[in-house]
């Protein structure tokens, strides 16, 4: 019975470690991108409270990832003329 309990605890512990590892991996990937160099605008203030008060690591990572994606779309549109990737493409031009 003790072995079973240990097995359950070990499994739960491993899952927690996996989640933390995944979070750190996401954070490292995002940190290589925008990494806070670019400031967010109105979009940051508009985030729901639940998101704003959730786990700091993941909120920060998500915010950075969002900025990274926004900048990528901007660069594609203004320097690459990739209109498909525009924020709102209404088919003009």
């Amino acid at each position: 019975r003790r072995d079973v309990a240990h097995g359950i605890l070990n499994e739960a512990y491993r899952k927690v470690l996996d989640q933390l590892s995944a979070g750190k991996h996401l954070q490292s990937l995002v940190a290589r991108g925008v990494g806070g160099s670019l400031g967010g605008g109105a979009g940051d203030d508009a985030e729901p409270l639940s998101k704003r008060h959730s786990d700091g690591i993941f909120t920060d990572s998500y915010s950075r990832y969002r900025k990274q994606m926004a900048v990528k779309k901007y660069l594609a549109a203004v320097l690459g003329k990739r209109y498909k990737q525009r924020v709102k493409n209404k088919g003009r031009r």
Partner: antibody
């Protein structure tokens, strides 16, 4: 695309520049601010996207605020220093530029 | 921060000749999203090239952009008097947005 609001200001006095567009749907385009100090090169300040979110160059964050309405895009220089003396350009997608507006910061 | 280094100014070119302007980036340009601009005194910049090598609408075919990664070049063939201007490259970076090169003045003789 036309910029306005440039003038002589003393250091620390907030200044708002306005970019007025006609025939352009701001909900479909990125609007960018670029500046150029007298006799110097171009310097990217930041942009505002279709949804109204603004993004800034690392050096510009906290020093500038970009916002927009239906036919205007504003650039606020929160606390100008002499280093902010420049011609400020507003551009749609970097392919349609205004003539620029000159800001002089001096005591 | 990303730095774009251009051919030092000024660059001289004879009418009908060819001139090449180099633009070297301190780090890889995202998606090769690099543009070239022409600016004349008292005027705003005019986009000549986007996506490193695509000619912007209405720009004469004597302008040609090439390169990828960290090294890009603007070549003007059959130079005309009207080409006298300062040329800027502008590269895209996910970590820094847009960075402009320092500019290269082309003098036509």
């Amino acid at each position: 695309v036309e910029e306005s609001g440039g003038r002589l200001v003393t250091p620390g006095t907030p200044l708002t520049l306005t970019c007025t567009v006609s025939g352009i749907d701001l909900s479909s385009y990125y609007m960018t601010w670029v500046r150029q100090a007298p006799g110097k090169g171009l310097e990217w300040v930041g942009f505002i996207d279709a949804g109204g979110s603004a993004y800034y160059a690392t050096w510009a964050k906290g020093r500038f605020t970009i916002s927009k309405a239906s036919t205007t895009v504003d650039l606020k220089i929160t606390s100008p220093t002499t280093e902010d003396t420049a011609t400020y350009f507003c551009a749609r997608d970097l392919d349609l530029w205004g003539p620029g507006t000159l800001v002089t910061v001096s005591s | 921060a990303a730095v774009l280094t251009q051919t030092p100014s000024p660059v001289s070119a004879a009418v009908g000749g060819t001139v090449s302007i180099s633009c070297k980036s301190s780090e890889s340009v995202y998606g090769d999203y690099l543009a070239w601009f022409q600016q004349k005194p008292g005027q705003p910049p005019k986009q000549l090239i986007y996506d490193a090598s695509t000619l912007a609408s209405g720009v004469p075919s004597r302008f040609k952009g090439s390169g990828s990664g960290t090294q890009f070049t603007l070549t003007i063939s059959g130079v005309q008097c009207d080409d006298a201007a300062t040329y800027y490259c502008a590269g895209g970076y996910v970590s820094a947005g847009v960075a402009f090169g320092g500019g290269t003045e082309v003098v036509v003789k």
